[in-house]
């Protein structure tokens, strides 16, 4: 990536890292308003299976692994990107490496959920306080999960699907920060590991993933009021290990693996019309990216 200053624009969709033949160090940003891509400062270490989030206007890259010709190293790293300076800086590492991690943000704190270290599949969860640059373990999930989708709704943290080391999962659970406890919620209609999970209009969406046999293009959403999962329109492409985010009331899914190819496709879901459309292509196909949107 280039080392010049990032243009000062509105909300951008950032995609960090990923995998194509090896873990990648790219940081790129898509501007939905004009359809352009920006090439930004590379991650200091290549990584795939990471997660991205934004706190206080800064982009954080959490966990993952560096799968390269030289070896394969799971990551406990937390790195912070400042869009104003186009620079990465390291933060305090997590207590354990977490590849194929999920993250969510509540009250400015980053929750790192599950993931794997070698053949260990974590149920542990830890919380990062940016002001103190410290991680602290919180209550573990009821289930070990890697390739877990994480979303925050109404200050509750949801962990959806994933892989427990033996089975791909359709189960989901919810973390209550005030009680420091997890509770199971209604299971999805579909087993999904490596799905894209996000929140839109008071619903949790789970898009794509892998059911243990095939990549999926189906999408379902959870209504917290009725505690039910309902299918919505499927994506055009089957994909697992995809990136997902919400921008101006629409869901964007980025890349992933369809069982044959590493996708460069970016699709956008409009909840008003219940339709998916291809909006752009990434500069190259990849899976296992970390994605987040900058705040205004």
């Amino acid at each position: 990536g280039s080392m010049g200053h990032a243009p000062k624009v509105g909300r951008l969709i950032y995609t960090a890292g990923g995998y194509f033949r090896q873990s990648l160090s790219y940081l790129e940003a898509y501007n939905p308003s004009d359809g352009t891509w920006l090439d930004l400062a590379d991650l200091q270490v290549p990584r795939s299976g990471l997660a991205g989030c934004v706190v206080g206007g800064l982009l954080y890259a959490v966990g993952g692994r560096n799968n390269s010709p030289d070896g394969n190293t799971d990551s406990s790293a937390l790195d912070c990107y400042n869009p104003m300076t186009n620079q990465w800086s390291p933060c305090a590492p997590m207590s354990v490496p977490r590849n194929r991690i999920g993250v969510g943000v509540i009250d400015g704190h980053i929750y790192a959920v599950g993931g794997s270290h070698g053949c260990i599949h974590h149920n542990s969860v830890e919380r990062y306080e940016p002001e103190r640059d410290e991680w602290h373990l919180v209550a573990p999930m009821l289930t070990r999960r890697i390739g877990v989708g994480v979303a925050v709704l109404n200050r509750l943290l949801y962990a959806v699907g994933g892989f427990d080391g033996t089975n791909r999962l359709n189960s989901a659970e919810c973390y209550y920060p005030e009680r420091n406890e997890w509770r199971m919620i209604t299971a999805m209609n579909t087993i999904r590991s490596g799905a894209g999970v996000c929140v839109l209009h008071n619903c949790i969406y789970a898009a794509g993933g892998y059911d243990g046999q095939d990549q999926l293009n189906s999408v379902e959403r959870y209504d917290v009021e009725t505690e039910t999962w309902t299918f919505v329109a499927p994506m055009k492409h089957r994909r697992s290990a995809l990136g997902i985010t919400v921008h101006q009331g629409r869901i964007y899914v980025l890349g992933g693996y369809d069982g044959h190819t590493f996708l460069d496709s970016v699709e956008c879901y409009d909840p008003d019309t219940d339709t998916w459309s291809e909006v752009t292509r990434m500069t190259s196909g990849r899976s296992g990216v970390g994605v987040a949107v900058t705040m205004e």
């Epitope: 795939s48 299976g49 394969n72 070698g118 892989f163 080391g165 290990a241 069982g259």
Partner: antibody, heavy 118, light 107 residues
């Protein structure tokens, strides 16, 4: 019945290339990670490469990284090992194996012999 | 890389004997160890996974155990068809590594 059948082995000169195939039946290769393991004549087993069906990520032993490429064609239910820049020390019987979630190879092919010699 | 040191490299035993083969990991591998049996000219066959779980269809005379980083394969009463080479394998961390093998021969 689960079966794995390797093919494509043979005699090749140093620096040459071969492509091994592993045809699966009785299960979908999209449902398990597929691994290649080799065994030099009179020696032990050495893990070579693997492919993850969920993320598409591949892993390689240091001894073959940059020279070998593992891939899978789910429509043909077949995995492949493309071997380039072959060396005498790559001479071995190459096995493909299915590795379910719990990390041990429960089914193996019969093996195919690769001989690298001038 | 994690080394799996297997011992003995060979042993001679009679039918009916109790046979024990050990693998020591150079660092912690949790219980992510498997044992395989291989006969000449044939592919390996899985016997034990996750250190102590007997694979489906494998006779109950085979068992596996773990003590820290030491892993043991035991054949409680050796049968004629058990004369073969046995390998341990760790899948705890990349790269997966095998022991050098133990050849069980007829005394």
């Amino acid at each position: 019945e689960v079966q794995l059948v390797e093919s494509g082995g043979g005699l090749v000169q140093p620096g040459g290339s071969l492509r091994l195939s592993c045809a699966a039946s009785g299960f979908a290769i999209s449902a398990s990670s597929i691994h290649w393991v080799r065994q030099a004549p009179g020696k032990g087993l050495e893990w070579v490469a693997s492919i993850d069906p969920e993320t598409g990520e591949t892993l390689y032993a240091k001894s073959v990284a940059g020279r070998f490429t593992i891939s899978a064609d789910t429509s043909k239910n077949t995995a492949y090992l493309q071997m380039n820049s072959l060396r005498a020390e790559d001479t071995a019987v190459y096995y493909c194996a299915r590795m379910p979630a719990w990390g041990s190879a429960d089914y193996w092919g019969q093996g195919t012999l690769v001989t690298v010699s001038s | 890389d994690i080394q799996m040191t297997q011992s003995p490299s060979s042993l001679s035993a009679s039918v009916g004997d109790r046979v024990t083969i050990t693998c020591r990991a150079s660092q912690s591998v949790s219980s992510a160890v498997a044992w395989y049996q291989q006969k000449p000219g044939k592919a390996p066959k899985l016997l034990i996974y996750s250190a102590s779980s007997l694979y489906s269809g494998v006779p109950s005379r085979f068992s596996g155990s773990r003590s820290g980083t030491d892993f043991t394969l035991t054949i409680s009463s050796l049968q004629p068809e058990d004369f073969a080479t046995y390998y341990c394998q760790q899948s705890y961390s990349f790269p997966s590594t095998f022991g050098q093998g133990t050849k069980v021969e007829i005394k």
